[in-house]
Amino acid sequence: EVEKTACPSGKKAREIDESLIFYKKWELEACVDAALLATQMDRVNAIPFTYEQLDVLKHKLDELYPQGYPESVIQHLGYLFLKMSPEDIRKWNVTSLETLKALLEVNKGHEMSPQVATLIDRFVKGRGQLDKDTLDTLTAFYPGYLCSLSPEELSSVPPSSIWAVRPQDLDTCDPRQLDVLYPKARLAFQNMNGSEYFVKIQSFLGGAPTEDLKALSQQNVSMDLATFMKLRTDAVLPLTVAEVQKLLGPHVEGLKAEERHRPVRDWILRQRQDDLDTLGLGLQGGIPNGYLVLDLSMQEALS
């Protein structure tokens, strides 16, 4: 807090310009009019103020707008945004994507701060849903953004926004998140032809159910092992050896290297050894010949 002192003669700021970098904090407090600052915020970002000087400018804006800054000021905050607390940001009403971009630009190259997270939350809540343009912007600045949302928050993503998602945006998503995103992706890409569809849907397949995997196995997709290893175990278990062979195509040989890891390990345990032997990969651990397999889940459903 800078104590109130009278502005020295001849130092009253008539505009926000470079001469202010020579002002001490108390002089900025005394000699810069808050309303002038608000109307010339776009200039602040071009002036090399120290971090401490920015504290004073923020204090002046806080006094002028105790209920929260108007968007006309927010859009031009620039580096002053780094001085804002989440509490400050919760008072804002940010509706323009341009404002969001301008503030994200200031934080570019850094981890998502609590301030940025609050800003994004305010913006998305104000819009009511995570539309394509917003998602495009957020994932451009923070590739992991989508995977930071809860399944509940992801449910507000319209299928049309899925077009903005790149494979790397889903790298840190867990199965619960992919469960929500997969049906949206399926809907978004439904009118694409087989090979194009697979390219687009591939990164979302961690949320795919068995019946969709079975359908894909009929389309010569040649799924790579990395994608296969990310599939839901419960979706892979019911697949037959023939279906997995069709699904993976030439990549089926990779199963040998992954035979001790889920979901491959669990899938092997469910297959007849005879069937596994047809792959010629030396996969071991299947059900020996002559054993009867009881599907207890089916029995429970019938009783």
């Epitope: 970098i21 071009a46 002036i47 090399p48 120290t50 620039g78 580096y79 780094l82 200031v106």
Partner: nanobody, 116 residues
Framework: QVQLVESGGGLVQAGGSLRLSCTAS????????MGWYRQEAPGKERELVA????????NYADSVKGRFTISRDNAKNTVYLQMNSLKSEDTGVYYC?????????WGQGTQVTVSS
């Protein structure tokens, strides 16, 4: 991140002179707008005393006008502060800074003590 190393400080009698140097690790230094700041004591505000832009144009705080001269040698990636007619109120740690909006990195500073 650009490293800045200040040197040339020391103990000097009032009325004496010192020449401070600030060398930057960055190539392309000539494009940078540079400034010298003074901090009277730890925790106190750093005050800007002089700036020099890429074209060699200079500006000074009122308290040092006519006594201090800022200059640069782009070939050596160095900016200087020639301080003459030193006064006891010039005592403090002197820091140089690349005057770029959003850049708040400082060197370790160099101590200047003026005894009366």
């Amino acid at each position: 991140q650009v490293q800045l190393v200040e040197s040339g400080g020391g103990l000097v009698q009032a009325g004496g002179s010192l020449r401070l140097s600030c060398t930057a690790s960055e190539s392309g230094f000539s494009a940078n707008y540079m400034g010298w700041y003074r901090q009277e004591a730890p925790g106190k505000e750093r005050e800007l005393v002089a700036t020099i832009n890429r074209f060699g144009s200079t500006n000074y705080a009122d308290s040092v006008k006519g006594r201090f001269t800022i200059s640069r040698d782009n070939a050596k990636n160095t900016v200087y502060l020639q301080m003459n007619s030193l006064k006891s109120e010039d005592t403090g740690v002197y820091y140089c800074r690349i005057m770029r909006p959003g850049n708040w990195y400082w060197g370790q500073g160099t101590q200047v003590t003026v005894s009366s």
